[in-house]
């Protein structure tokens, strides 16, 4: 039993960020005369939250009217709670002293815990594109949550991934926390339409996790396959050669025709066709005037895709010269070769 007791009935209070916290405190006596003050923390570094005697505390309101006679309820409300407000709050009775007020009795303290939602997860992929069969890393970050317990999962097209590492910082006590996770994903040729999803579950989200996504279309590069073919003769002394550029992504592609190593024509892929898997096909053709050539012609289709080193495919046209009066045609023979 004591002359005056300061009673803080709540050992702990849990409040969602943005809400108002009510910290309860009553005294068993109004004597001796002196103000009630609220502090966060204990010891010399404690932070004054409210002083009945003086001061301006815009976020704090008293639950009851402290100017009312015989009022022994010194509970306060703190508005717009943020994770930075977490800590132990003490209701402290001071007595008038000479010359300064003297701490008389303290309550046992109320621990304020703040529940704060994690920020929307941000997923980022590699800086440079990668080709199928390569492993690429994706990172996921979310910040500002409390308490520390959190669950993070990775998915690719709805399938959960297992190859990832996650850290929650800081390790010790803090007002709020951040999560950082890195997942490894093996690319396939079919991944243009694929998505990588980072899913974060936290007590503040009430079973409705937050998701961040990354489209593998931003990450993958599918190199083209080339096929050069000779079309049937369309006119005397002319041969139509086509270069089929298949299954490439992204669309950025430049094609150059070379005749015996000399540039004949350069063009940029424009009217492409899109495949179901998101890759593109394109075809270019070259009309060769055989009569202009005395010897065999080596035709090369050279493709530079997405700034990568050029790939090429060649086709040999064998030129057989016959006297005109015999009216013979130029023969063309396909001896294709693939060069890089």
């Amino acid at each position: 039993e004591e002359e005056l007791q300061v009673i803080q009935p709540d050992k702990s209070v849990l409040v969602a960020a943005g809400e108002t916290a009510t910290l309860r405190c009553t005294a068993t006596s109004l004597i001796p005369v002196g103000p009630i003050q609220w502090f966060r923390g204990a010891g010399p570094g404690r932070e004054l939250i409210y002083n009945q005697k003086e001061g301006h505390f815009p976020r704090v309101t008293t639950v009851s009217d402290l100017t009312k006679r015989n009022n022994m309820d010194f509970s306060i409300r703190i508005g717009n709670i943020t994770p930075a407000d977490a800590g132990t709050y003490y209701c402290v009775k001071f007595r008038k002293g000479s010359p300064d007020d003297v701490e008389f009795k303290s309550g046992a303290g109320t621990e304020l815990s703040v529940r704060a939602k994690p920020s929307a997860p941000v997923v980022s992929g590699p800086a440079a594109r990668a080709t199928p069969q390569h492993t690429v890393s994706f990172t996921c970050e979310s910040h500002g949550f409390s308490p520390r317990d959190i669950t993070l999962k990775w998915f690719k097209n709805g399938n959960e991934l297992s190859d990832f590492q996650t850290n929650v910082d800081p390790v010790g006590e803090s007002v709020s926390y951040s999560i950082h996770s890195t997942a490894k994903v093996v690319l396939t040729r079919e991944d243009v339409h694929s998505q990588v999803i980072c899913e974060v579950a936290h007590v503040t989200l009430q079973g409705d996790p937050l998701r961040g996504t990354a489209n593998l279309s931003e990450t993958i590069r599918v190199p083209p396959t080339l096929e050069v073919t000779q079309q049937p003769v369309r006119a005397e002394n002319q041969v139509n050669v086509t270069c089929q550029v298949r299954k490439f992504y992204p669309q950025r592609l430049q094609l150059t025709w070379l005749e015996n190593g000399n540039v004949s024509r350069t063009e940029t892929a424009s009217t492409v066709t899109e495949n179901k898997d998101g890759t593109y096909n394109w075809m270019s053709w070259l009309l060769v005037n055989v009569s202009a050539h005395r010897d065999d012609v080596k035709l090369t289709c050279q493709v530079e895709h997405d700034g990568q080193p050029a790939v090429s495919k060649s086709h040999d046209l064998k030129v057989s010269a016959h006297p005109k009066e015999q009216g013979s045609n130029t023969a063309a023979e396909n001896t294709g070769s693939n060069e890089r």
Epitope: E3, Q52, N70, K96
Partner: antibody, heavy 114, light 111 residues
Framework: QVQLQESGPGLVKPSQTLSLTCTVS????????VNWIRQPPGKGLEWIGI???????DYNSALKSRVTISVDTSKNQVFLKLSSVTAADTAVYYC????????WGQGTTVTVSS | DIVLTQSPASLAVSPGQRATITCRAS??????????MHWYQQKPGQPPKPLIY???NLESGVPARFSGSGSRTDFTLTINPVEANDAANYYC?????????FGGGTKVEIK
Amino acid sequence: QVQLQESGPGLVKPSQTLSLTCTVSGFSLTGYGVNWIRQPPGKGLEWIGIIWGDGSTDYNSALKSRVTISVDTSKNQVFLKLSSVTAADTAVYYCARAGKMDYWGQGTTVTVSS
Amino acid sequence: DIVLTQSPASLAVSPGQRATITCRASESVDSYGNSFMHWYQQKPGQPPKPLIYLASNLESGVPARFSGSGSRTDFTLTINPVEANDAANYYCQQNNEYPWTFGGGTKVEIK
């Protein structure tokens, strides 16, 4: 139940130090303060000072230079020392519990005389 | 120091009548919404007995015939109706400022 009992010499010579003891029961001296109050014969009450539960003290400024209040919590006793007494210090001396002065001892009479 | 002036110095009242004692402080004894003024009854050869605390609150065991009122500098103790054993000295006391002080007392006699 709560009780306070003053004790000490009934007669003190002028210029000497008056020493009184207040022995308490029914409450803890770490939880409650104890006041000393005196009443000269046929006159009103005068507050001398208080020792709080934490051992800190506050004194009447008129007597401050001569007064010391101390405590021995293990013996449940509070002590009053008043130095350089004169006939004007003749009074009934009371101890009373806490800032509220809700319980009083019966008082002890101290006469300052040679 | 806060000086407390009680009036009247003495008062004779018939049983069943009302007795009113006033206490005027030289400065306000109000702090934090409360008046730190208290009243005591003292009978000859006895220590003071608390009657009223914080201007208007009855101490436990004190009959409801006793009541207190007032704020800041002006306070009143009322006994209604007076009974024969109410004959005593009555003191007001403040503990709002150091040094704590008592009024000079009012002697109540029963006719």
